[in-house]
């Protein structure tokens, strides 16, 4: 069963229908509106089965509407139920005010229904001209709206309506006088120089789009000088003046083509600085040092003068950055007065010149560099200096032959001595001195100088070989050695050795009282304040003992015989004969004879007598070994 | 017993002098030549000088030659160290020692400290 | 300093250490060797080729080849820790001069 249809309206322009029916009976439901009057051809919905209500929108305000329905089911109509209903009256706007008000722009308020409007429709129009209005939109969910971009002191009348697909509301309307354009707040020199001063001014933020600044010479008709500037700075510095100028400086803020009252200021620049101060002093002997104060970023450059006093002729001319408030100027004569002038340039403007007069130092001498104490690892060196003039200096060591490091030494500048160490003996070297003060560094000098050798001991050598000793020599540094130890072993270690010590001075020892043909070895030590050196060695075999032999008799006769025999050639001096008879009746003869004979005739004895004969041997003062015979005279 | 007793030591300042003497006993004083040593605090020895039996002949580092004189009286048995125009440097414990002929320093006495400082 | 010496050493107890030094002077002297503990003078312990002094102990011997000497103590013992010199000399006009000095530690 279908029933209790009731209609109510939805706002102005809609209609809300409600209804019952048994449930899950209906395929669908037929709905039919027209306008009770029956202006406009009816509108047919159908709406699903499972509905019991639906809206219908988009109707005419203030109008009486028919409504039907009937549902369907498995294809048959039930019967038609109708009513009748009104939409409502279309909505107007509330009340619209001017919230705020600037110069340039205000804030529009209003109020409306929820949801009536689309959007509103804002227009914009000078009062009292017939320049096109400003229109605007805006959303119909806004209450509010800036209008940006007015003329400052002047009438608008701003119109809204409120906007629907089909409507369109009655217009509200407003006036409204904007404000008159911010004056500017304060104009300030902060800076003033000679050639600039720097403007500082205040000014509400954003409110200017650009502001153009006036600099007029006061007093002059010649053009002023215009500067434009961003409307976002609060302070331009103004170059390129005059000095000792008086000047008018206006300052005035643009925005969108309105001018704010000018704000004016009078100013006169500094007079051009001058130069201050300028000292010179020496440096050294070669060079002198100007300083002199001037302005911090005046100059353009400095032009120096500098000249002898005696010689005008001849100057040295110097242009230097404007930055500068020293110099050294080097390369001049020692001992010599000077004349130094200078005068700054800026923008082709000289300063007055500044004068000062100074003089060169006498020039700084080394020399008489001297080598003494020259040991096998050191010397001594000494040189004369001036006095009071080098910080420090500097002593290279370089050996001649370049192969070892080149050492450097940098001593204060008072001394005039060094001790040079640690240099490898025996070795030529080549010391370089310099003098060094503040901007002066002398002409070197040089001197050469040897390490001794260490002290040697050298060249053992054996002479004079006998049978019962020999000669040992050695070499030796002059003054190296306190003493020598000379020791003699036997080869065979059979014997206790022998030592000899002697003075530093002797290089040779005459050894005697050995042992014949047997080895010995030799060693030589030098020492040195207790220090022994390695020892030199040397071997050697003593000669054996010069031998006589093979003494035969012969040619007896009643009162001599004749005696032969052999010996070492070149070993024995002389040799002796002793001649006794074996019954010892008569004195001994002795005879001696010279090295080289061989045989001698024995006469002036007893007949048939038998005589005991020895013979031996003299060589070097001593004996050989004595050699025997028996010999008979004849009988008579 | 060889004994070799230094003194002399103490505190000076730069540029002042000092003499160390150092008596020996229990030896041939006249036939040992005789010598100093140095060691400053902390550091290495370092030979000062030394003189030959009868005296005639004195030897010298070069550290101190110039201002250093050394000298004995063989007839007191001492030895003797003049030191002049003494600096920071020169502060040490200060060793007199003897050598026989043949071999170097062999007894040493237990040392005199010698301080130099303003 | 003309000799030169490596500033320490040190060696296991029983062990046997080596002490070198090193100077021109070595290529024609022997090294002495001297020993010296804390607060003491020094000792003489080998002199000339190896030779040493009455008293001192056969464990320490010395050597030398070239421009380099060496003292070796066979069997370190504990009072053996101490500084150790070596002296020689550079000829008449340096007729002593000394080595930096060895701290020989006993582990």
């Known amino acids: 069963e279908l029933e209790n249809l009731t209609v109510t309206e939805v706002g102005w322009d809609g209609l809300r229908l409600n209804w019952t029916a048994a449930d899950q009976a209906y395929e669908h439901f037929i709905i039919q509106v027209q306008e009770a009057n029956k202006v406009e051809a009816a509108r047919n919905l159908t709406v699903p089965g499972s509905l019991r209500a639906v809206d219908i929108p988009g109707l005419k305000a203030a109008t009486p509407y028919t409504v039907s329905i009937y549902g369907v089911i498995q294809g048959y109509r039930t019967p038609v139920l109708s009513a009748e209903a009104s939409t409502g009256e279309t909505p107007n706007l509330g009340e619209v005010v001017v919230a705020e008000v600037g110069w340039d722009a205000l804030k529009l308020n209003w109020t409306a229904p929820e949801g009536a409007y689309e959007y509103f429709f804002i227009q914009v129009q000078e009062a009292d001209t017939v320049e096109a209005a400003q229109n605007l939109t805006v959303p119909g969910g806004l209450r509010s709206t800036d209008l940006p971009g007015l003329k400052a002191a002047t009438h608008y009348t701003i119109t809204i309506r409120g906007v629907t697909q089909d409507f369109s509301t009655t217009p509200l309307s407003v006036e409204v006088l904007t404000e008159e354009v911010p004056d500017m707040g304060n104009l300030t020199v902060t800076e003033v120089s000679w050639d600039a001063l720097r403007l500082n001014w205040t000014t509400p933020d954003g409110t200017y789009d650009q502001f153009t600044i006036q600099v007029q010479e006061a007093d002059q008709v010649e053009e002023a000088h215009n500067l434009t500037v961003p409307g976002s700075l609060r302070s331009m510095e103004i170059p390129g003046l005059r000095a000792g100028t008086p000047y008018t400086v206006t300052l005035h803020g643009e925005v969108r083509g309105h001018s704010t009252r000018p704000l004016a200021v009078e100013v006169v620049t500094e007079d051009l600085p001058q130069l201050g101060d300028l000292a010179v002093s020496e440096v050294g002997w070669d060079g002198l040092r100007l300083n002199w104060t001037a302005a911090d970023n005046a100059y353009e450059h400095f032009v120096i003068q500098v000249q002898e006093v005696n010689k005008v002729e001849a100057a040295q001319n110097l242009t230097l950055p404007g930055s500068l408030r020293a110099v050294d100027i080097p390369g001049l004569e020692a001992a010599t007065p000077y004349r130094v002038s200078i005068y700054g340039v800026i923008r082709g403007y000289r300063t007055p010149v500044l004068s000062a007069e100074a003089s060169t130092a006498k020039e700084p001498e080394i020399g008489n560099l001297n080598v003494s104490d020259i040991t096998p690892e050191s010397f001594n060196l000494s040189w004369m200096a001036t006095d009071g003039i080098f910080e420090t200096f500097t002593i290279e060591i370089i050996d001649s032959n370049r192969l070892l490091e080149t050492v450097e030494y940098n001593i204060s500048g008072a001394e005039r001595t060094a001790h040079i160490s640690g240099l490898p003996p025996s070795t030529d070297f080549i010391v370089y001195l310099s003098g060094l003060a503040p901007s002066i560094r002398t002409k070197t000098i040089s001197a050469t100088a040897t390490t001794e050798a260490l002290p040697l001991l050298e060249n053992l050598t054996i002479s004079d070989i006998n049978p019962y000793g020999f000669t040992v020599s050695w070499m030796a540094s002059e003054n190296a050695f306190d003493s020598f130890l000379v020791t003699v072993v036997d080869s065979g270690k059979l014997l206790d050795p022998q030592e000899f010590t002697l003075s530093g001075t002797q290089r040779k020892l005459e050894l005697r009282g050995l042992i014949t043909g047997i080895g010995y070895e030799v060693m030589v030590s030098g020492f040195t304040q207790g220090h022994q050196t390695k020892p030199l060695r040397a071997e050697i075999v003593t000669e054996a003992e010069p031998e006589v032999d093979n003494l035969l008799v012969s040619d007896a006769t009643p009162d001599g015989f004749r005696l032969s025999w052999t010996a070492d050639e070149g070993v024995f001096d002389n040799f002796v004969l002793k001649i006794r008879d074996t019954k010892k009746q008569s004195e001994p003869l002795e005879i001696t004879l010279l090295a080289p004979e061989r045989t001698r005739d024995i006469t002036g004895l007893r007949e048939a007598t038998e005589y005991e004969i020895e013979l031996y041997g003299i060589s070097k003062g001593r004996r050989s070994q004595t050699v025997s015979a028996i010999a008979t005279t004849a009988m008579g | 017993e060889v004994q070799l007793l230094e003194s002399g030591g103490g505190l000076v300042q730069p540029g002042g002098s000092l003499r160390l003497s150092c008596a020996a006993s229990?030896?041939?004083?006249?036939?040992?030549?005789m010598g100093w040593v140095r060691q400053a605090p902390g550091k290495g020895l370092e030979w000062v000088s030394a003189i030959n039996e009868e005296g005639g002949q004195t030897y010298y580092a070069d550290s101190v030659k110039g201002r250093f004189t050394i000298s004995r009286d063989n007839s007191k048995n001492t030895l003797y160290l003049q030191m002049n125009s003494l600096r920071a440097e020169d502060t040490a414990v200060y060793y007199c020692?003897?050598?026989?002929?043949?071999?170097?320093?062999?007894?040493w006495g237990q040392g005199t400290l010698v301080t130099v400082s303003s | 300093s003309e000799l030169t010496q490596d500033p320490a050493v040190s060696v296991a107890l029983g062990q046997t250490v080596r002490i070198t030094c090193q100077g021109d002077?070595?290529?024609?002297?022997?090294a002495s060797w001297y020993q010296q503990k804390p607060g003491q003078a020094p000792v003489l312990v080998i002199y000339?080729?190896?030779s040493r002094p009455s008293g001192i102990p056969d464990r320490f011997s010395g050597s030398s080849s070239g421009n380099t000497a060496s003292l070796t103590i066979t069997g370190a013992q504990a009072e053996d820790e101490a500084d150790y010199y070596c002296?020689?000399?550079?000829?008449?006009?340096?007729?002593?001069?000394f080595g930096g000095g060895t701290k020989l530690t006993v582990l």
């Open positions: 229990g030896f041939t004083f006249s036939g040992s030549r």
């Open positions: 020692a003897k050598h026989p002929p043949h071999r170097p320093f062999d007894y």
């Open positions: 000339g080729k190896s």
């Open positions: 002077s070595l290529r024609l002297y022997y």
């Open positions: 002296n020689s000399s550079h000829g008449p006009r340096r007729p002593v001069v």
